[in-house]
């Protein structure tokens, strides 16, 4: 049985809050597909399991996420 | 209108296996939390876990861990808890709950609660 | 994981009465906490999100208070359909953790 082609983005709207990388888990980038025709990015946040939808066009968050993938590339040997 | 329906009352005996499921409507079911709490006869509530279905981020209490699974099917908006090898004490009432979002941001504490499902495992 | 104990486990009281209900965290939690109500036979109900929020539809004699570790409920003037068990619960750090309920029974 095919799915269902309901658009089902997780993002229902984007958090104009800062984030403040160190009190960030994880962060997760989800591509456009057909169920959702726009980029998501989500962040986890340590504390009270809040998952914050966050605006891929922001200048600031785009900072964010060349932060965390230079954080990561140290990381990885 | 929010609604969470569980699935149907379960009689099992000991060792057998079992998935009980809780359907969400009348919200966007991948952005919410959603989350099982077990209540035995005559006690309080006790934090299974919880499950965010647009990413699939599963988190357990201690005290369940290993003993159950909580999945999630976000294209039918049903979110489920397994067990694989019932015991007598795992007879309980077992809710499931939807978490809150305000402005971008989810959370899992339970704004909407599931009907309950009873589960009793005896011989 | 961080524990709540609730107290009093029980309480009798009388229609009319301002009843105050504790929570107390093993730790700091900020003010994320929340309130339940349950009725028996019946699933759980949110009454307060945020240690002082008031869940949409819940009558206003119903107040949070608190942060840190020490929380409160009061129902400001209790009212017979008040009569039930009530938990709080934190949502700072999982595991997730419920108190132990408060039984408020007619006097």
């Known amino acids: 049985v095919p799915l269902s082609r309901t658009v089902r983005c997780t993002c229902i709207s984007i958090s104009n809050q800062p984030v403040n990388p160190r009190s960030l888990e994880k962060l997760e980038i989800i591509p456009a597909s057909q169920f959702c025709p726009r980029v998501e990015i989500i962040a986890t946040m340590k504390k009270k399991g809040e998952k914050r939808c966050l605006n891929p066009e922001s200048k600031a968050i785009k900072n964010l996420l060349k932060a965390v993938s230079k954080e990561r590339s140290k990381r990885s040997p | 209108e929010v609604q969470l329906v569980q699935s149907g009352a379960e009689v099992k005996k000991p060792g057998e296996s079992l998935k009980i499921s809780c359907k969400g409507s009348g919200y966007n079911f991948p952005s919410y939390w959603i989350g099982w709490v077990r209540q035995m006869p005559g006690k309080g509530l006790e934090w299974m876990g919880v499950i965010s279905p647009g990413d699939s981020d599963t988190r357990y209490s201690p005290s369940f861990q290993g003993q159950v699974t909580i999945s999630a099917d976000k294209s039918i908006s049903t979110a489920y808890l397994q067990w694989s090898s019932l015991k007598a004490s795992d007879t309980a009432m077992y809710y499931c709950?939807?978490?809150?979002?305000?402005?971008?941001?989810?959370?899992?504490?339970?704004?909407?609660w599931g009907q309950g499902t009873l589960v009793t495992v005896s011989s | 994981a961080i524990q709540l104990t609730q107290s009093p486990s029980s309480l009798s009281a009388s229609v009319g009465d301002r009843v105050t209900i504790t929570c107390r965290a093993s730790?700091?939690?900020?003010?994320?906490l929340a309130w339940y109500q349950q009725k028996p036979g019946k699933a759980p109900k949110l009454l307060i999100y945020d240690a002082s929020s008031l869940e949409s539809g819940v009558p206003s004699r119903f107040s949070g208070s608190g942060s840190g570790t020490d929380f409160t409920l009061t129902i400001s003037s209790l009212q017979p359909e008040d009569f039930a068990t009530y938990y709080c619960?934190?949502?700072?750090?999982?595991?997730?953790?419920f108190g132990g309920g408060t039984k408020v029974e007619i006097k």
């Open positions: 619960q934190q949502f700072d750090s999982f595991p997730h953790t």
């Open positions: 730790q700091g939690i900020s003010s994320a």
């Open positions: 709950a939807r978490g809150y979002c305000s402005g971008g941001s989810c959370y899992p504490f339970f704004q909407y």
